[in-house]
Amino acid sequence: FPQDRPFEDTCHGNPSHYYDKAVRRCCYRCPMGLFPTQQCPQRPTDCRKQ
């Protein structure tokens, strides 16, 4: 949807982040083997081992 575009572009091309359309925010992608501690992680400390 058009209103998502400007926000989505801020994450574009950054493999460590993704754009969550539901919360309309750029989120940090937890590395494999780690799990998020919140719905839209913002930094590596928002990821932990299960």
Epitope: Y18, D20, K21, A22, V23, C27, R29, C30, M32, F35, P36, T37, Q38, Q39, C40, P41, R48, Q50
Partner: nanobody, 123 residues
């Protein structure tokens, strides 16, 4: 990279049924979620339902509880949304999302999105 492809949308009369499919390809996290969102023109995107694919636990928005059922076919890496007793207010673009279960919570990240499938319910 995970790719999500939705299908099954269309036009239906009020009271009718549709079944949406969301096929996932690529790497899928072992502790993951797949869910459905919808957005009607001029309205906010709304969460509809999700399934925690490891445990099979399902969750629904109050607006669809008792009418919609989310299920999975692990062999096909596909999640389905069976929509019964459809109402005109269910008209929207339906998006599939995939992500990981948040530790200590029943919510999920929404890391991957499909392109959406349109559902139109007429009275």
């Amino acid at each position: 990279q995970v790719k999500l492809v939705e299908s099954g949308g269309g036009s239906v009369q009020a009271g009718g049924s549709l079944r949406l499919s969301c096929a996932a390809s690529g790497y899928i996290y072992s502790s993951n979620c797949m869910g459905w969102f919808r957005q009607a023109p001029g309205k906010e995107r709304e969460w509809v339902a999700r399934i925690h694919t490891g445990s099979g636990s399902t969750y629904y928005a109050d607006s669809v509880k008792g009418r919609f059922t989310i299920s999975q076919d692990n062999a096909k890496n596909t999640v389905y949304l069976q929509m019964n007793s459809l109402r005109p207010e269910d008209t929207a673009m339906y998006d599939c999302a995939a992500g990981r279960v948040v530790l200590g919570a029943v919510v999920c990240t929404n890391e991957y999105w499909g392109q959406g499938t349109q559902v139109t319910v007429s009275s």
